[in-house]
Interface confidence: low
């Protein structure tokens, strides 16, 4: 039995709210609408939310009950379309109400917004959160579920489910902990951090299925999952894929309740069949529902199995490699990708696809040659380069890294792709450089074996970053082209950009590096990225400065910032002084 | 849909032989090369044999040397494992799997080699 197949359901919300039981119905309904009407104020919401469950509720005690057999779609697009305010907030996204299903529901889709203009989340006292999590903990987590959600439509709905159980939990131990906050906040920096991971992970993962299609999500999980499961045989590796596409699929298109519930299914067939599957499964699977998928997701590669025959046999020697790739294209090219990741977790993801997609143009090209065979004999030899170039980029920046710290290694990425993408925004290109310079705290401690996996995978996820936000206000042809050609060639395209020479510099403007006493009170991290707009800004206007000019103006900042913190009149210190820093620092570059 | 259905294990006696077949469907078999493996009663996977999608490449782990031969039939998508020279360590429930994976999703067939 297929894990997905099920009996026909006369009504398919009564079927979901049976599955995955009121709280969680309600919880991922909420999620789904604040994706969708990323505006509308949280009582909104929750009125919807709760009038859907009433619904639901009815069809459950009486499935023939009138419209309880509509689509899921058909009924939450009904209901978003109920909002009085929809023209005046969303614009012409109202136009998507005048649309049928499924035209309707892909225009929603469409309006999805991956930057929306939300004031940023201000942490209040913990005394205050811990009040109002005990006044009313359902109304508190549901709006940690509607915050999230609305600012990051595309999250792993399932998966934020598991992180406002987290968040729960951290508020029921520290509000009644000694010291509330030395138990509270790290715990919720930890939450955060990890959620904007988690959403740019499954952005990336939403990406490659609506730009590049299922044949690439089925292919970037056929290696992620052979080299985590390399004892699996290759039937049950093609089969967790085709569940996994299927599960991700729905949560990319808007379908949450079918998405949660097919994940619980799958993370109940891979338990089932852990024997079958990986060794490293048995602790994920004693775990509660969320937990257990959450888990499972996250788990370490297994052991590879001991003295695998090489891959040439098959691939390269075997005189039926062109019948065989002829008669079964893609499946052929899955076992390649399946026995070439599971012996190579040490690979990037997007390396090994990049490997299959030489094999696969090269079958492409030596099939049809007169001697087939000594066309592709040496086709192995062709992956050499394409294995070297990440490594030595990994070597390269892990030196850097290691000899700047995190903080300058950031700085020296925001020069050097202010440079290749100068039109992009400021925002993004700090946003993005910051969270490139992270590959190094996160990459460059692992041994050798676990670096490339590691950073070229990362780098892939926060490349992603850019491009979502680049095609949102597309400005760079160049950032157009390395973001639509290829999505395993992302970081090779960007890593090739040189200095555009193209872009005419920006006019100085002495208002972009004029500073205030209010600098003074920030923390470290809105301090440095103060610091890291103005290097970005720097670029702008003098794309050819070098880096010897660039280090002495961002001194001479670091050392304005601290004296004037530190003067009795900071108000004064920051404006006298900052206009000299201004005149040396056009001196320096020649401005 | 993925299947791989063993057949032909059973109670043999030492010295006896027995054949294996695997009868394969919902992928292209001709397309990849096969192995046979086995799990003893408390102990894990272990690999025996593997062949290539054409059959003109065998391979075996050294204890079954001489005595298993494995084979093929792209025609009828089935693999074979011949058996000879049986022997009580031999007993096991034996897998056919695609590739050279040592783990399954099949069924498998129980062969038991005893006096």
């Known amino acids: 039995r297929g894990v997905f197949r099920r009996d026909a359901h006369k009504s398919e919300v009564a079927h979901r709210f049976k599955d995955l039981g009121e709280e969680n119905f309600k919880a991922l309904v909420l999620i789904a609408f604040a994706q969708y009407l990323q505006q509308c104020p949280f009582e909104d919401h929750v009125k919807l939310v709760n009038e859907v469950t009433e619904f639901a509720k009815t069809c459950v005690a009486d499935e023939s009950a009138e419209n309880c057999d509509k689509s899921l779609h058909t009924l939450f697009g009904d209901k978003l379309c109920t909002v009085a305010t929809l023209r005046e907030t969303y614009g012409e996204m109202a136009d998507c109400c005048a649309k049928q299903e499924p035209e309707r529901n892909e225009c929603f889709l469409q309006h999805k917004d991956d930057n929306p203009n939300l004031p940023r989340l201000v942490r209040p006292e913990v005394d205050v959160m811990c009040t109002a999590f005990h006044d009313n903990e359902e109304t508190f987590l549901k709006k940690y579920l509607y915050e999230i959600a609305r600012r990051h439509p595309y999250f792993y709905a399932p998966e934020l489910l598991f992180f406002a159980k987290r968040y729960k939990a951290a508020f029921t131990e520290c509000c009644q902990a000694a010291d509330k906050a030395a138990c509270l906040l790290p715990k919720l920096d930890e939450l955060r951090d990890e959620g904007k991971a988690s959403s740019a992970k499954q952005r990336l993962k939403c990406a490659s299925l609506q730009k590049f299609g299922e044949r690439a999500f089925k292919a970037w999980a056929v290696a992620r999952l052979s080299q985590r499961f390399p004892k699996a045989e290759f039937a049950e590796v093609s089969k967790l894929v085709t569940d996994l596409t299927k599960v991700h699929t729905e949560c990319c298109h808007g379908d949450l309740l079918e998405c949660a519930d097919d994940r619980a299914d799958l993370a109940k067939y891979i338990c089932e069949n852990q024997d079958s599957i990986s060794s490293k499964l048995k602790e994920c699977c004693e775990k509660p529902l969320l937990e257990k998928s959450h888990c499972i997701a996250e788990v370490e590669n297994d052991e590879m199995p001991a003295d695998l025959p090489s891959l040439a046999a098959d691939f390269v020697e075997s005189k039926d490699v062109c019948k065989n790739y002829a008669e079964a294209k893609d499946v052929f090219l899955g076992m390649f990708l399946y026995e070439y990741a599971r012996r190579h977790p040490d690979y990037s993801v997007v390396l090994l696809l990049r490997l299959a997609k030489t094999y696969e143009t090269t079958l492409e090209k030596c099939c049809a040659a007169a001697d087939p065979h000594e066309c592709y004999a040496k086709v192995f030899d062709e992956f050499k380069p394409l294995v070297e170039e990440p490594q030595n980029l990994i070597k390269q920046n892990c030196e850097l890294f290691e000899q700047l710290g995190e903080y300058k290694f950031q700085n020296a990425l925001l020069v050097r792709y202010t440079k290749k993408v100068p039109q992009v925004s400021t925002p993004t290109l700090v946003e993005v450089s910051r969270n490139l310079g992270k590959v190094g705290s996160k990459c460059c401690k692992h041994p050798e074996a676990k670096r490339m996996p590691c950073a070229e995978d990362y780098l892939s996820v926060v490349l992603n970053q850019l491009c979502v936000l680049h095609e949102k206000t597309p400005v760079s042809d160049r950032v157009t082209k390395c973001c639509t050609e290829s999505l395993v060639n992302r970081r090779p395209c960007f890593s090739a950009l040189e200095v555009d020479e193209t872009y005419v510099p920006k006019e100085f403007n002495a208002e972009t590096f004029t500073f205030h006493a209010d600098i003074c009170t920030l923390s470290e991290k809105e301090r440095q990225i103060k610091k890291q707009t103005a290097l970005v800004e720097l670029v702008k206007h003098k794309p050819k400065a070098t880096k010897e000019q660039l280090k002495a103006v961002m001194d001479d900042f670091a050392a304005f910032v601290e004296k004037c913190c530190k003067a009795d009149d900071k108000e004064t210190c920051f404006a006298e002084e900052g206009k000299k820093l201004v005149a040396a620092s056009q001196a320096a570059l020649g401005l | 849909q993925v299947q791989l259905q063993e057949s032909g294990g059973g109670l043999v006696q030492p010295g006896n032989s027995l054949r294996l077949s695997c009868a394969a469907s919902?992928?292209?078999?001709?397309?990849?090369?096969m192995s046979w493996v086995r799990q003893a009663p408390g102990k894990g996977p272990e690999w025996v044999s593997s062949?290539?999608?054409?059959?003109?490449?065998?391979r075996y782990t050294d204890s079954v040397k001489g005595r298993f031969t494995i084979s093929r039939d792209n025609a009828k998508s089935t693999l074979y494992l011949q058996m000879n020279s049986l022997k009580p360590e031999d007993t096991a429930v034996y897998y056919c799997?695609?590739?050279?994976?040592?783990?399954?999703s099949s069924q498998g067939t129980q062969v038991t080699v005893s006096s």
């Open positions: 799997t695609i590739g050279s994976s040592i783990s399954r």
């Open positions: 919902g992928f292209s078999f001709r397309s990849f090369g």
């Open positions: 062949i290539n999608s054409s059959g003109d490449d065998t």
